[in-house]
Interface confidence: low
Amino acid sequence: GELETSDVVTVVLGQDAKLPCFYRGDSGEQVGQVAWARVDAGEGAQELALLHSKYGLHVSPAYEGRVEQPPPPRNPLDGSVLLRNAVQADEGEYECRVSTFPAGSFQARLRLRVLVPPLPSLNPGPALEEGQGLTLAASCTAEGSPAPSVTWDTEVKGTTSSRSFKHSRSAAVTSEFHLVPSRSMNGQPLTCVVSHPGLLQDQRITHILHVSFLAEASVRGLEDQNLWHIGREGAMLKCLSEGQPPPSYNWTRLDGPLPSGVRVDGDTLGFPPLTTEHSGIYVCHVSNEFSSRDSQVTVDVLDPQEDSGKQVDLVSAS
């Protein structure tokens, strides 16, 4: 006869491991007992359990409640055992020694491999600001056995670097994602992807990028100067900018205080019916925690009578 087993049994942490040991005997052969032991190199054999054809299952105190026979129906030639709730310390070499008659004793070894799935964590880097050089966007760490694979999934252009720390029964892998911050990255997802044989599917942790910036300011509303004439109603100037965090707006007049009746409503400066007093240099000041910008425009309120007089002069001059 001969023993049938597996070279390696792989189980995920917390699952039950079946340690196979089946005697493929000739007709009439019987199994008297099956002795299981842990036989790690450099250490003496540690008794695990004894399956006796007459006296049943005996379990070492160190494994009490954790070693069982597979559920019935059982083949008397099957010396397999179940190791419940596998922990990392169970990883190692095991030996089953089968005593048969009349053929004698047989033994086989297997290696129990306990996969420890990682619990990844993602840590954002320092605040990202447009204009910075290569900056840490995030780091992702996962520890497991065997060492997990840590990669990144993103549309953002960047560079990655990884390092590994090896412990007695596991390895921690840390991957860093560096980028040169730009406003186009704002709101873009940066996903850490952790792969491991103990995981049914990759684990993913997503970090949304926030890049501080402030765009140049400009003022809209003066595109047609001819509309800025005495008596016009509803005239307004609008300050254009964008930023992260969203900017605040402030309006001032360079050559004096804002005229009475002028309304400041965030990015918009609203005028009452225009008079020549509204002529002047207006400044839009845009700021956020990152930066500040200014844009100024000159408002020249036209007097239609003056303008028409000038036109008559021009005509008569011709």
Partner: nanobody, 121 residues
């Protein structure tokens, strides 16, 4: 005992191709991730490519992306590296590598003896 045996190296002209093989034994081949490293004269050993136990996940150094392809045949316990569009800077000794955890030992890294790849006209 973990054993790794590389083959397939040789002398090839720039632009040519080679296929390296690594026969493995002594560990759970279909579970363990494996990789190829290389060491050029006077330089440190550097990672070239790696592959998961299932073969579904691969990774490449920037210098070989689009030119090298890693694969494995778990039924034959063999790891491969297909190298196309070879350049003189690819000249190095190429090593097969795996990381195996056994019992209480810290024996993570196992290496083969290496196979020489020389790219020259």
């Amino acid at each position: 005992e973990v054993q790794l045996l590389e083959s397939g190296g040789g002398l090839v002209q720039p632009g040519g191709s080679l296929r390296l093989s690594c026969a493995a034994s002594g560990f759970a081949f279909s579970i363990d991730a494996m990789g190829w490293y290389r060491q050029a004269p006077g330089k440190e050993r550097e990672g070239v490519s790696s592959i998961s136990g299932s073969g579904g996940l691969t990774r490449y150094a920037d210098s070989v992306k689009g030119r090298f392809t890693i694969s494995r045949d778990n039924s034959k316990n063999t790891l491969y590296l297909q190298m196309n569009s070879l350049k003189p800077e690819d000249t190095a000794v190429y090593y097969c590598d795996t990381a195996v955890l056994t019992g209480y030992s810290e024996a993570f890294d196992y290496w083969g003896q290496g196979t020489q790849v020389t790219v020259s006209s």
